[in-house]
């Protein structure tokens, strides 16, 4: 199926041009999305082109400036947050990135009723996290690893925790591993629905081994960055959850929430917290061996001022074929009775589906079913449940939004998006206002992305929020590559692939092939989304065919494919890339002497192993920031899929699956190894060990490091990286510069 047909016709050829590397590096063909910042059922905020913060009322159709660009500029604000009572706005400036989600910033509070900044009891700086209560204008913030509370912005703060200490005790914010691998947020505190209580996590990293690396900067001596980072098998953070009454915070102080006995008996993780009501909270816990998860519903006991988590309100989710959940264990979406909930987990056929849990997980009512997967529950209202899935036309790389009417019996299902803009839009997400009165749909492709506003009752489109007209016009004279998404059936395994073909593709000719791989557990590369990126350029200008293949271990096609890699990372992911390459060669248009593979992060690991597979298929390849041994990567991620690196568990496969173990096999390929020296995630250690093994085996290879760059290799490093990789591939494929 050709998703993005080239617009080239003979008469137009003279005016059309190919993509250039400069186009990609300059972001010339980047697209915009529009996510409303909902503040009620019918109102949202949005930052206008001229940087005013504007309120839009859907019902009246009118806009209102609530914060002028001058006010924003007066403190160099790059972000804002409106208090729910609409009395104040916080303005965020001096953004300073830390890890993937975390950053520190300076915060100013602006009073909307008098148009002035709040003076007196100003916030300290820099703050690690700050948020309004869900009702009113209480403030909770984290400063120097401790949590503070303000009843009103101008009030003096009440200090909730006192034991916070850099790299030791984290209150209300996650440590490195919880941020990256468990919570996927910069915060670890949660207000109850009406702001009566504040729950927070405390992470104790005292006994965690520290990763240390040099940050060269421009001083005479480099700095050393120290991060408590538990690698596979190492000591993990100790987590505790506390809840404090924010109305009378000094009365009884923070109360600890008990951990379920079956969890507390060995090493465990806290995975998420969901408030149900002001006096009911749901916590999710996970054993260190991540195939058992417990969802615990706890109630506030007024008489004792404590939180009680009865065993009858513990729901166990266990996997016998892999790990619990997909990438993460799914979170519950509670219904209006405040005890039953909807949750995505594997059905008896091994497909992730929505279930309704009223009393026990064993008695769960399955809401969706089929050989496809429910991916996200967006919203549950009194009469509807909105979710996304890849059911439509059996393409796993699509996302459509569905509505199930739960108010009627039997419940009826309607695809909201399937036929809206069928050619242009096959991959959606959604953003809902209060009570799903309205919602925005954001379509990511395969055509040019478009964001639209819809009535939550009738699903009628109200207006286009962003249609990327400028992008559409800019692309009119560009020879875009063709894209097709198809599947290969090999030994009872379905391998979906995306192929990106040069604009004047001719099946009778031979083309160099580049495989782009990620391949990590529960990932998906073959998606029906729009992108004009480096590989688009390689196809458009350099005449390469690029292929992405979703093999075993990838997501949204059932547990058989997903859990196939359980406890044996680095085997089937590589095999499936190789199998796909052989199938591509059989198609007749691939020059089998010019095949390359490249990947980043997990993809760097897979590309390295593929190059060292000894098949002779690959002429060259690139690994950017690769994992080289699972013993070097984070405990939470690695052990989820690999178990522990101990003799009585899975040490043997930890050792067998390293890149270093295959150093000899790199002798007959051209290998380019790239890594940032300040990579906090996949440590430079990984590439250092590959390089050492290659040197020890006297194998020639090319390498590039990026000083003081992290896992993202951003800024000027990006330009250098893609320029360098382009030269390497052109040389490998004997393409003239």
């Amino acid at each position: 199926i050709v998703l993005r047909p080239s617009r080239v016709h003979n008469s137009e050829e003279n005016t059309m041009r190919a993509l250039t590397l400069k186009d990609i590096l300059n972001g010339t063909f980047s697209y915009k999305t529009f996510f409303p910042n909902w503040i009620s059922g019918q109102e949202y905020l949005h930052q206008s082109a001229d940087n005013n913060i504007v309120l839009y009322n859907i019902e009246t159709g009118q806009s209102y400036t609530i914060l002028s660009n001058r006010t924003m500029k007066s403190v160099n604000a790059s972000n804002y947050g409106l208090s729910p009572d609409r009395q104040f706005v916080y303005l965020e400036s001096d953004y300073s990135k830390l890890w993937r989600y975390s950053y520190t910033a300076t915060y100013y509070i602006y009073d909307l009723s008098n148009g002035e900044f709040v003076r007196g009891n100003e916030l300290p700086r820099p703050i690690q996290y700050l948020c309004w209560s869900p009702v009113g204008s209480k403030l909770a913030y984290v400063y120097q690893n401790n949590i503070y509370l303000k009843q009103r912005p101008g009030d003096p703060p009440f200090q909730i925790t006192f034991n916070g200490r850099e790299n030791k005790i984290f209150n209300g914010i996650p440590d490195w591993v919880y941020e990256e691998e468990m919570l996927a947020t910069k915060y670890a505190l949660w207000w109850s629905p009406n702001g009566k209580f504040l729950a927070y996590a405390e992470f104790n990293d005292t006994d965690i081994p520290v990763i240390a690396y040099s940050y060269y900067g421009d001083e005479q001596y480099p700095r050393t960055i120290n991060i408590p980072y538990p690698k596979a098998g190492a000591k993990n953070p100790v987590v505790r959850i506390f809840i404090i009454d924010t109305t009378y915070p000094a009365y009884v102080g923070p109360q600890e929430v008990p951990v379920p006995a079956m969890i507390a008996s060995s090493d465990y993780y806290f995975s998420w917290l969901t408030w149900v009501t002001d006096e009911r909270v749901c916590l999710q816990w996970l054993k260190r061996v991540q195939n058992v998860s417990v969802l615990s519903i706890c109630d506030f006991r007024e008489d004792w001022q404590t939180w009680d988590c009865p065993k009858t309100q513990e729901h166990i989710e266990e996997s016998r074929t892999g790990w619990a959940g997909g990438f993460f264990v799914s979170t519950p979406v509670f219904s209006y009775d405040a005890i039953s909930y909807y949750k995505i987990f594997s059905d008896k056929d091994g497909y992730k589906h929505i279930h309704y849990i009223k009393d026990t997980v064993e008695n769960a009512i399955q809401i969706t079913s089929g050989k496809w997967e429910a991916i996200n529950i967006f919203r549950v209202t009194q009469d509807s449940l909105f979710y996304s899935s890849n059911e439509f036309e059996e393409y796993p790389g699509r996302r459509n939004i569905y509505r199930i009417s739960i108010g009627s019996y039997p419940p009826s299902k309607k695809c909201v998006t399937c036929h809206l803009r069928k050619e242009r839009c096959q991959y959606y997400t959604a953003s809902f206002s209060d009570y799903a009165k309205y919602y925005a749909l954001v379509c990511y492709g395969p055509g040019i992305p478009i964001s639209t506003l819809h009535d939550g009752r009738t699903d009628q489109e109200i207006k286009i929020l962003e249609e990327n007209k400028e992008l559409e016009n800019a692309l009119k004279n560009i020879q875009l590559p063709k894209e097709e998404i198809k599947k290969l059936e090999v030994d009872e395994i379905t391998l979906w692939y995306k192929m990106i073909l040069p604009p004047q593709f001719d099946r009778s000719k031979k083309y160099p092939l580049l495989i782009q791989v990620y391949g990590g557990p529960c990932s998906q590369s073959v998606r029906s989304v729009f992108a004009v990126n480096w590989i688009s350029y390689l196809a458009s200008k350099e005449g390469m065919v690029i292929a992405l293949v979703d093999g075993r271990g990838t997501a949204f096609q059932g547990d058989k494919l997903l859990y196939a890699v359980y406890r044996k990372l680095g085997v089937y992911e590589v095999e499936d890339q190789i199998t796909a390459v052989r199938k591509f060669i059989e198609m007749g248009f691939i020059d089998e002497k010019r095949i390359a593979i490249w990947g980043w992060s997990y993809g760097g690991y897979v590309s390295s192993l593929a190059l060292a597979s000894g098949t002779g298929l690959f002429k060259c390849g690139i690994a950017v920031a690769p994992v080289s041994s699972w013993e070097y990567y984070a405990s939470v991620y690695t052990e989820r899929f690999m178990g522990l690196p101990t003799k009585d568990d899975n040490l043997e496969h930890y050792k067998n699956s390293t890149v270093m173990a295959r150093a000899e096999y790199f002798r007959n390929v051209d290998y380019l190894l790239i890594h940032g020296t300040a990579d906090d995630n996949v440590h430079f250690q990984n590439s250092a060990q590959i390089a050492k093994a290659l040197v020890n085996a006297q194998v020639d290879f090319q390498a590039m490091w990026y000083s003081d760059q992290n896992h993202g290799l951003s800024g000027l490093s990006t330009n250098h990286l893609y320029t360098h990789m382009t030269h390497f591939l052109k040389q490998c494929f004997s393409l003239s510069d």
Epitope: S40, Q62, T65, I66, R86, S113, V135
Partner: antibody, heavy 119, light 111 residues
Framework: EVQLLESGGGLVQPGGSLRLSCAAS????????MDWVRQAPGKGLEWVGD????????IYNQKFKGRFTISRDNSKNTLYLQMNSLRAEDTAVYYC????????????WGQGTTVTVSS | DIQMTQSPSSLSASVGDRVTITCRAS??????????INWFQQKPGKAPKLLIY???NRGSGVPSRFSGSGSGTDFTLTISSLQPEDFATYFC?????????FGGGTKVEIK
Amino acid sequence: EVQLLESGGGLVQPGGSLRLSCAASGYTLTDYNMDWVRQAPGKGLEWVGDIYPNTGGTIYNQKFKGRFTISRDNSKNTLYLQMNSLRAEDTAVYYCTRFRGIHYAMDYWGQGTTVTVSS
Amino acid sequence: DIQMTQSPSSLSASVGDRVTITCRASESVDNYGLSFINWFQQKPGKAPKLLIYGTSNRGSGVPSRFSGSGSGTDFTLTISSLQPEDFATYFCQQSNEVPYTFGGGTKVEIK
């Protein structure tokens, strides 16, 4: 100090037209929406409509739609109300107000200008 | 349109009295936890002045003796201790739905 000063009121015959002006000072016009409200002699207050000065987007009380038009000139920091096909019942004091959108509140009012529709 | 009914239409009170004016909307004006009910004070020959916005928030420079409360359809303006300068007409107004509508007014007179 925020000040709103209406002008342009007067006596007009039924069926006639009138254009009211409102000069805003003490703040930037584009920072707030502007509304017109009228008050008939001895009667209550009646909302006419609202304008978003940045784009000129307007909303009206359905009762006045088609006859009354709100516009603005940002360079002059001035708001206008064009009234056509005037009737005797349009006789009132017309106030221009600054509308604080986040609170849906008219926080500053002009002193008003009187419009009399009579033959 | 939402009708706003004020009561009483007039009242007589003395300086120092506690005065309560009520306003009833023909339908709920709750907007997801907020009610866009505003109160204005108008003196003869003058423009109205914003006293209370969003049900209970005092406007700029408004004395603390003025307070507002209510939700749904029923709202109240309270003057805790009437002062000589408070003798005026008071209007409630809803901004929850277009057209924005005003109550008929309550005239507070000297007893």
